[in-house]
Interface confidence: low
């Protein structure tokens, strides 16, 4: 997260760290007791490593009573996701067992009504992604509030040049932005999961290159079918 600040510890109990061989790779969001939603491209970087999900964490390194690492029973990328595009960049991870819920571990309600968030709405994005262009990684969860940017502006030739489909949304990126390592994490508007950080290699913190998020409401049928 660029231009953000340290999050209040355990105030985002839905927050997950998707890890490979014990290292943070991507963000994720607990959407059901046994399911974490993340970005499909995150798996590409996992190669053949052991994928696990850390829940209940604030610090990645320090012991915390609520922290627990779960093995992944099943990884289900969206069937239409492709390595060369950010379209359909969603991944559902089934934990090896139901998560132990508590104040620091709780699923987040996700948006099912397929309607765009009003431009200008302030939404919260959190993650353990890099906090500087030099690539410095934080140990503790960071967050930032970002205004939603309308799709027409986001699709301007000077911005994302038409790449933003109806199934995506954008947020402003003027110095405050999600960045590498935040992919798969939640964009939360009004206490509801609206978007998932896409995992393309995008310049961060440049206002002409807004953050791109996959709109979960556009994938309600797919999410329901996997969770069923």
């Amino acid at each position: 997260i660029l231009g953000g600040r340290e999050a209040e510890a355990h105030a985002r109990p839905y927050m997950a760290s998707v890890q490979v061989n014990g290292e943070h790779l991507c963000g994720g969001v607990l959407v059901a007791e046994q399911w974490v939603l993340s970005a499909a491209h995150c798996l590409e970087d996992a190669a053949d490593g052991k994928v696990q999900v850390l829940l209940g964490a604030h610090s990645l390194s320090q012991p915390e009573p609520s922290k627990r690492l779960y093995d992944v029973l099943r990884a289900v990328p969206h069937p239409d996701s492709r390595p060369d595009t950010i379209d359909h960049d969603l991944l559902l991870l089934q934990l090896s067992e139901k998560a132990t819920l508590g104040p620091a571990v709780r699923p987040l309600p996700w948006q099912r009504v397929d309607r765009d968030v009003e431009p200008g709405t302030l939404c919260d994005v959190a993650g353990w992604g890099i906090v500087s262009h030099a690539g410095r990684r934080p140990d503790r969860l960071q967050h930032v509030l970002l205004p939603v940017l309308d799709r027409a502006t986001c699709n301007r030739r000077t911005h994302h040049d038409g790449a933003i489909t109806q199934r995506m949304m954008c947020a402003e990126s003027n110095r405050r932005d999600s960045c590498k390592g935040d992919s798969g994490g939640p964009l939360v508007c009004g206490g509801v999961l609206e978007g998932v950080v896409t995992s393309g290699s995008r310049v961060c913190g440049n206002r002409k290159k807004p953050g791109i998020y996959t709109r979960v409401a556009s994938y309600a049928a797919w999410i329901d079918s996997v969770l069923a």
């Epitope: 595009t85 765009d116 431009p119 309308d150 799709r151 027409a152 502006t153 699709n155 030739r157 994302h160 040049d161 038409g162 790449a163 933003i164 489909t165 109806q166």
Partner: antibody, heavy 122, light 107 residues
Framework: EVQLQQSGPELVKPGASVKISCKAS????????MNWVKQSPEKSLEWIGD????????TYNQKFKAKATLTVDKSSSTAYMQLKSLTSEDSAVYYC???????????????WGQGTLVTVSA | DIVMTQSHKFMSTSVGDRVSITCKAS??????VDWYQQKPGQSPKLLIY???TRHTGVPDRFTGSGSGTDYTLTISSVQAEDLALYYC?????????FGGGTKLEIK
């Protein structure tokens, strides 16, 4: 199927105003700028301006800034253009047009309304 | 404003011929050029965008080329239904501007 349905022909008196409409269907109205283009025999095609249906923000061709006002009604997915202080030079066919996008690249004005003929005559 | 000049207002050709319609911009527009076809009584129809990319459903006899200030629309083998007005347009900077049009007539 993307469609832009414009209002019918208008016969108006010099000095009057006219408001023409363009109803969009088959795509997300708020996702793409709506453009307006004038076609007259003398000047061929001229871009009047565009409006961002999501925010109502407009960009005008300076030449038309005092002549045209662009608005939208998101609830009905309709764009409007009001032309004021009409003269015979404003007699023309007016089109609404929207760019559309495929994959990751901008496409020109891929969709056009059928045009609205405005005739200014005493 | 960027001026787009189509030097030929009319071009006469025969069915099966190859024809090239040219367009010159008053400054470098970095391939941000679209081509439109307009048949009598119809709205303009997008043929080519980004100077050389054919729009969906456009026959492959239509080809766009060019860079900098000079752009060309080529019809490799003219068909009777290609009788129309052809316009270039720049989307490099606002106000977007069109050429004056070239009317293709069939001999």
């Amino acid at each position: 199927e993307v469609q832009l349905q414009q209002s019918g022909p208008e016969l108006v008196k010099p000095g009057a105003s006219v408001k023409i409409s363009c109803k969009a269907s088959g795509y997300s109205f708020t996702g793409y700028y709506m453009n307006w283009v004038k076609q007259s025999p003398e000047k061929s095609l001229e871009w009047i301006g565009d409006i961002n249906p999501s925010t109502g923000g407009t960009t005008y061709n300076q030449k038309f800034k005092a002549k045209a006002t662009l608005t939208v009604d998101k609830s009905s997915s309709t764009a409007y253009m009001q032309l004021k202080s009409l003269t015979s030079e404003d007699s023309a066919v007016y089109y609404c047009a929207t760019p559309y996008y495929y994959g990751s690249s901008y496409v020109g004005f891929a969709y056009w309304g059928q045009g609205t003929l405005v005739t200014v005559s005493a | 404003d960027i001026v787009m000049t189509q030097s030929h207002k009319f071009m006469s050709t025969s069915v099966g011929d190859r024809v090239s319609i040219t367009c010159k911009a008053s400054q470098d527009v970095s391939t941000a050029v679209d081509w439109y076809q307009q048949k009598p009584g119809q709205s303009p129809k997008l043929l080519i965008y980004w100077a050389s990319t054919r729009h969906t459903g456009v026959p492959d006899r239509f080809t766009g080329s060019g860079s900098g200030t000079d752009y060309t629309l080529t019809i490799s083998s003219v068909q009777a239904e290609d009788l129309a007005l052809y316009y270039c347009q720049q989307h490099y900077s606002t106000p977007w501007t069109f050429g004056g049009g070239t009317k293709l007539e069939i001999k």
